[in-house]
Amino acid sequence: EEELQVIQPDKSISVAAGESATLHCTVTSLIPVGPIQWFRGAGPGRELIYNQKEGHFPRVTTVSDLTKRNNMDFSIRISNITPADAGTYYCVKFRKGSPDHVEFKSGAGTELSVRAKPS
């Protein structure tokens, strides 16, 4: 079977401050089992934006129903965008592990730029 790919189709998007940003991400396989997480930035300094399994992420909603068994769409919508939200967002697939999940594969990233709110 072909190895799972994480696809972020948008290289960049631009959103006005105060609006919502939709960040698209799909995977090509249900295997390996494990959650998706979204990060802003890469490397050790990256910010956790959304974790499928734990935490409370009030500005983030998922575009699809992640509880559906065969779901492969892990796109998210971030509401009320501010200048501090600008950056590159990565959709990252983790392999289920104990006690911690292990990072398996990352998407190529989507750069979010924030425009000034139209007056």
């Epitope: 910010e47 009030p58 200048p83």
Partner: antibody, heavy 119, light 108 residues
């Protein structure tokens, strides 16, 4: 219930070091950015430092940059502030504060730890 | 850096008399403004976030309004237990996170 409990405060001489701890409970600690905020006697609130959920991203106020180091141990649900080369003007109550989400306000505060720097 | 200016520095009101506190930002912060209450000898407590949303457990006599650069915290009918210092906090531009200088509310 969310609880944040600081410890490690005390009286030190100028130039000495101190490490503050903040024990967190009642929420998924590893999913949230955390901050230190201080309050000098009779003064207002001053943000000191922030660390992202994974621990790899840190920010500091100019007044403490190069002297203070923020860190966290997600396996112990504990936040730290290592304070070196302490000055009289660092005398304050130090609060740890949880962020509502990564780019947001502080929704819970600890009770505070008093640090006194005096010769 | 965004500077937050609170006024008045001190506000003295009688119980039941409306209290209005102001916070002005040096540049727009959208609706990204919170209010915190700090009673003497206690830690701060979140009251209002996103300019107008009450935090969990906050009585409805507290309300927030405004957007852009001008914000208001209103205590519609202050109680003696509302004696405290009130701080605004912006989280539109950071770091650094900025707080206003505070308004001390005294209930006569």
């Amino acid at each position: 219930d969310v609880q944040l409990v600081e410890s490690g405060g005390g009286v030190v001489r100028p130039g000495e070091s101190l490490r503050l701890s903040c024990a967190a409970s009642g929420f998924s600690f590893r999913s949230y950015a955390m901050n230190w905020v201080r309050q000098a006697p009779g003064e207002g609130l001053e943000w000191v430092s922030r660390i992202n959920s994974g621990g790899g991203g840190t920010d500091y106020a100019d007044s403490v940059k190069g002297r203070f180091t923020i860190s966290r141990d997600n396996s112990k649900n504990t936040l730290y502030l290592q304070m070196n080369s302490l000055r009289a003007e660092d005398t304050a109550v130090y609060y740890c504060a949880k962020q509502y989400d990564w780019n947001s306000f502080f929704d819970y505060w600890g009770l505070g730890a008093l640090v006194t720097v005096s010769s | 850096e965004t500077v937050l200016t609170q006024s008045p520095a001190t506000l003295s009101v009688s119980p039941g008399e409306r209290a209005t506190l102001s916070c002005r930002a040096s540049q727009t912060v959208g609706s990204k403004l919170a209010w915190h209450q700090q009673k003497p000898g206690q830690a701060p407590r979140l009251l209002i976030y996103d300019a107008s949303n009450r935090a969990t457990g906050i009585p409805d006599r507290f309300s927030g309004s405004g957007s852009g650069t001008d914000f208001t915290l209103t205590i519609s009918s202050p109680q003696t237990e509302d004696s405290a210092v009130y701080y605004c906090q912006q989280y539109y531009y950071w770091p650094p996170y900025r707080f206003g200088g505070g308004t001390k509310v005294e209930i006569k």
